[in-house]
């Protein structure tokens, strides 16, 4: 359920507020609907960077749970093949705040277009 993914993103944003994490993350800020699965996979990969950089058990557990939920939601969409989409490394690098903002936006796109 994508709303549960949103819940975990809110938890992560609450948890990182008191931390200073300098990492920049590959961020898709303008997702074409026909590339949303590819973009989501990039977000999930980059999310693990936040988990590692924070060194925080609560963040690690929340990220782990979020990835499981998101992968379950993606698999329920069936095996979608997308072509002509950007590789993760081609995306713009943004700070954590902007990354999470764009992450919420793409999850909302999955909800809105389901």
């Amino acid at each position: 359920n994508w709303v549960n993914v949103i819940s975990d993103l809110k938890k992560i944003e609450d948890l990182i507020q008191s931390m200073h994490i300098d990492a920049t993350l590959y961020t898709e800020s303008d997702v074409h609907p026909s590339c949303k699965v590819t973009a989501m996979k990039c977000f999930l990969l980059e999310l693990q960077v936040i988990s590692l950089e924070s060194g925080d058990a609560s963040i690690h557990d929340t990220v782990e749970n979020l990835i499981i939920l998101a992968n379950n939601s993606l698999s329920s969409n069936g095996n979608v093949t997308e072509s002509g989409c950007k590789e993760c490394e081609e995306l713009e690098e943004k700070n954590i705040k902007e990354f999470l903002q764009s992450f919420v936006h793409i999850v909302q796109m999955f909800i809105n277009t389901s």
């Epitope: 709303v3 819940s7 809110k10 944003e13 303008d30 609907p33 919420v104 909302q108 909800i111 277009t113």
Partner: antibody, heavy 119, light 108 residues
Framework: QVQLQESGPGLVKPSGTLSLTCAVS?????????WSWVRQPPGKGLEWIGE???????NYNPSLKSRVTISVDKSKNQFSLKLSSVTAADTAVYYC????????????WGQGTLVTVSS | SSELTQDPAASVALGQTVRITCQGD??????ASWYQQKPGQAPILVIY???NRPSGIPDRFSGSSSGNTASLTITGAQAEDEADYYC???????????FGGGTKLTVL
């Protein structure tokens, strides 16, 4: 600075169709944002009507869904609202608004236009 | 009935602090945004996300969230803060946007 401007008839007859357009300037309707219509009956609170993404995806308030159509015209940088089978209860100030990226918000609003349903 | 509940009215003495609340189960998943609306005017976004203020919004406005409740706090209320305040978020399905019923703030 993004600006939104609603236009359309201020008076609609009962059982008729309310039609409004929102012209977007200072920004592109083909941005990553969703675009919404919100209304406010006189002396009452705000009610979300529905939203559209420039690829044509729409979501509507379940209580209005059977009567609402929102469409987008990228060439004119505008989006439109149609509300059918109107009654006096649909009399309200109608606002168009741009949704922010990420967490729910409306970061830009039109000034609003009063639509009265009366014969 | 609205999925977001606000008290209809609140008051604050000039220069004092007031907190306006918004309750709803959906706020466990989503942050709320807050709008100020004065008579005859369109709403203005004052807080969005965790606690973000759009440019031009005074820093006396702040937002917070705990459990199923979101709060808007005005620290050192001014006469010009007298207005209606609405919270906004998504519903439990995530598909629909919803507003609270609004809180009329009077500055005494």
């Amino acid at each position: 600075q993004v600006q939104l401007q609603e236009s359309g008839p201020g008076l609609v007859k009962p059982s008729g169709t309310l039609s409004l357009t929102c012209a977007v300037s200072g920004g592109s309707i083909s941005s990553s944002n969703w675009w919404s219509w919100v209304r406010q009956p006189p002396g009452k609170g705000l009610e979300w009507i529905g939203e559209i993404y420039h690829y044509g995806y729409t979501n509507y308030n379940p209580s209005l869904k059977s009567r609402v159509t929102i469409s987008v015209d990228k060439s004119k940088n505008q989006f439109s609202l149609k509300l059918s089978s109107v009654t006096a209860a649909d009399t309200a100030v109608y606002y168009c608004a741009r949704e922010g990226i990420g967490w729910p918000s409306f970061d830009y609003w039109g000034q609003g236009t009063l639509v009265t349903v009366s014969s | 009935s609205s999925e977001l509940t606000q008290d209809p009215a609140a008051s604050v003495a000039l220069g004092q602090t007031v907190r306006i609340t918004c309750q709803g189960d959906t706020l466990r998943s989503y942050y709320a945004s807050w709008y100020q609306q004065k008579p005859g005017q369109a709403p203005i976004l004052v807080i969005y996300g965790k606690n973000n203020r759009p440019s031009g919004i005074p820093d006396r406005f702040s937002g917070s969230s705990s459990g199923n409740t979101a709060s808007l706090t005005i620290t050192g209320a001014q006469a010009e803060d007298e207005a209606d305040y609405y919270c906004n978020s998504r519903d439990l399905s995530g598909k629909n946007l919803v507003f609270g019923g609004g809180t009329k703030l009077t500055v005494l």
